[in-house]
Interface confidence: medium
Amino acid sequence: QRFAQAQQQLPLESLGWDVAELQLNHTGPQQDPRLYWQGGPALGRSFLHGPELDKGQLRIHRDGIYMVHIQVTLAICSSTTASRHHPTTLAVGICSPASRSISLLRLSFHQGCTIASQRLTPLARGDTLCTNLTGTLLPSRNTDETFFGVQWVRP
Amino acid sequence: QRFAQAQQQLPLESLGWDVAELQLNHTGPQQDPRLYWQGGPALGRSFLHGPELDKGQLRIHRDGIYMVHIQVTLAICSSTTASRHHPTTLAVGICSPASRSISLLRLSFHQGCTIASQRLTPLARGDTLCTNLTGTLLPSRNTDETFFGVQWVRP
Amino acid sequence: QRFAQAQQQLPLESLGWDVAELQLNHTGPQQDPRLYWQGGPALGRSFLHGPELDKGQLRIHRDGIYMVHIQVTLAICSSTTASRHHPTTLAVGICSPASRSISLLRLSFHQGCTIASQRLTPLARGDTLCTNLTGTLLPSRNTDETFFGVQWVRP
């Protein structure tokens, strides 16, 4: 259904407007495919307004539909490297709570060295998003090459 | 901090809603890697609501966090061409004022003929965004293959 | 012009907030390059809030500027397959009403097995968006690999 109280005036806070843009901090130890993120003005152009970081993973604070976007560039990469080491795959998913675990977005590098995508998805308060990079190639930590973010779109 | 006056009613204008979608006008002369953009209903489906064009570069009129997106397709391209002419790289950055100059988003074509990505970034009134295409390959001017836009997301 | 009644208070409904995220249902019969979409909570994380599906194609219910995004992954694909069967191309366009027919976004797979992009575009009530996949390769129906969505951004 649409909006029950359609004519009700809209307080600024209720817009939600939760938003975060993160930069890569580090990869996990072996056997841990997760990328670990960081954000904040001191680090450059990354920020968190609403969502929080929990041990390098992004935790949602407001229910709603979100636009999730990501770009990951492999650090030492040519089209030959990328195909020789195939499959290198990136998956963004809800990793906790376990009851809501699901893959939201998945891309393979094939002969490319960068993947970038975005999608709309419902997220709930407490959902933690994980970004898993499987394969032997390492991601670039350059802030204009590898980044991950969410934007609250509507309730 | 979140919103100081959370319950204040929201006037339409304060939503910002600055948005622009541009199509490629032309590339720069040799030694100038910038792409020059154009926008307006007379040109098709491109538009500027808030931001302005300054000599083919996009200038921001409202402070805030923006979603910046771009797609560039190389005009005369096959996977062989793209790899033979590597590196062809696209970078989107703030090019003026000089004090705020920074690369926001960067992608290489490798064996592909199209790059597309998006990111959230804080921009300030007066920031001018430049899109630099380095390499010998030319971009397509088809409006469904090459475009560049911004969308104000929140203060 | 900007907003005539800038200080008018904003009712929740007038925000529009029309949004949809769809998953692939099936491809068309031979000679029909269209992808047919489906959406709804029962199907997973897809949804329609405002727009509707008309025989698997997305129909817009509110005038405005929309962010249109798509990701399509080829199901049975390696970089060799993708290049061997080139050109496999995805185009998103307005397919009806015929008077407004236009291609909005176009990408070729070249040596990759996934394309993903997004753009801002004005859409009008009644516009139906079609996604045409030309070539002999089939798209993956995995919901994290192939999806299509729109988000109302502003009037």
């Epitope: - | - | 692939l24 199901a75 049975i76 694909c77 060799t80 397959t81 061997r84 002999t136 089939l138 129906r141």
Partner: antibody, heavy 122, light 112 residues
Framework: QVQLVESGGGVVQPGRSLRLSCAAS????????MHWVRQAPGKGLEWVAV????????YYADSVKGRFTISRDNSKNTLYLQMNSLRAEDTAVYYC???????????????WGQGTLVTVSS | DIVMTQSPLSLPVTPGEPASISCRSS???????????LDWYLQKPGQSPQFLIY???YRASGVPDRFSGSGSGTDFTLRISRVEAEDVGVYYC?????????FGPGTKVDIK
């Protein structure tokens, strides 16, 4: 147009060897996976082996594993099946078939040769 | 190995009438990419086999639209909406999910 022509069949004694060839034309041979499929007289079809477009992967039916070897020469547009230690139950018409092209070995056989008969008999 | 079974093994048909053949696999042929890896072939008398249907329901190039494939997982059906005299022969299904590929025993279709 696509053409596949098998050769090399004939009568051979049990335990002996034979090499079948399949000459391909009308398409870019080096881009496609290729298969051998056989059919015993009056019986159904049996898949024998596949080789990827670049020769990097080869797979075999259990009934021929260790005895048959599939190979290809992309410079000659030719597919081969080396058959060693032949048995009476290998008697069949052997067809070469092009992979549908959706990847190395996971789609249909879209073009077939006319077949070559191999008879294993003492 | 995946075992394929077909029924019936023999199917007398009347031209202009519909016909259907069933194929069953011993394990699911639904791949993680959402497609069923089952193909259908027709071998006309005295000829090499020809490609009909791939991935369960996709008609191969040049195949008349009276042929259709359906099913998912382990149960599949090939349908001919209106049989023509030229449709006689042996119809085979095949597991194309994993090697070794395995054909069904075949269904012989002939005119009544």
């Amino acid at each position: 147009q696509v053409q596949l022509v098998e050769s090399g069949g004939g009568v051979v004694q049990p335990g002996r060897s034979l090499r079948l060839s399949c000459a391909a034309s009308g398409f870019t041979f080096s881009s496609y996976g290729m298969h051998w499929v056989r059919q015993a007289p009056g019986k159904g079809l049996e898949w024998v082996a596949v080789i990827w477009y670049d020769g990097s992967n080869k797979y075999y039916a259990d009934s021929v594993k260790g005895r048959f070897t599939i190979s290809r020469d992309n410079s000659k547009n030719t597919l081969y099946l080396q058959m060693n230690s032949l048995r009476a139950e290998d008697t069949a018409v052997y067809y070469c078939a092009r992979d549908g092209g959706y990847s190395g070995y996971d789609s249909g056989f879209d073009y077939w040769g006319q077949g070559t008969l191999v008879t294993v008999s003492s | 190995d995946i075992v394929m079974t077909q029924s019936p093994l023999s199917l007398p048909v009347t031209p202009g009438e519909p016909a259907s053949i069933s194929c069953r696999s011993s394990q699911s042929l639904l791949n993680s990419n959402g497609y069923n890896y089952l193909d259908w072939y027709l071998q006309k008398p005295g000829q090499s086999p020809q490609f009909l249907i791939y991935l369960g329901s996709y008609r191969a190039s040049g195949v008349p639209d009276r042929f259709s494939g359906s099913g998912s997982g382990t149960d599949f059906t090939l349908r001919i909406s209106r049989v023509e005299a030229e449709d006689v022969g042996v119809y085979y299904c095949i597991n194309s999910l994993q090697t070794p590929f395995t054909f069904g025993p075949g269904t012989k279709v002939d005119i009544k």
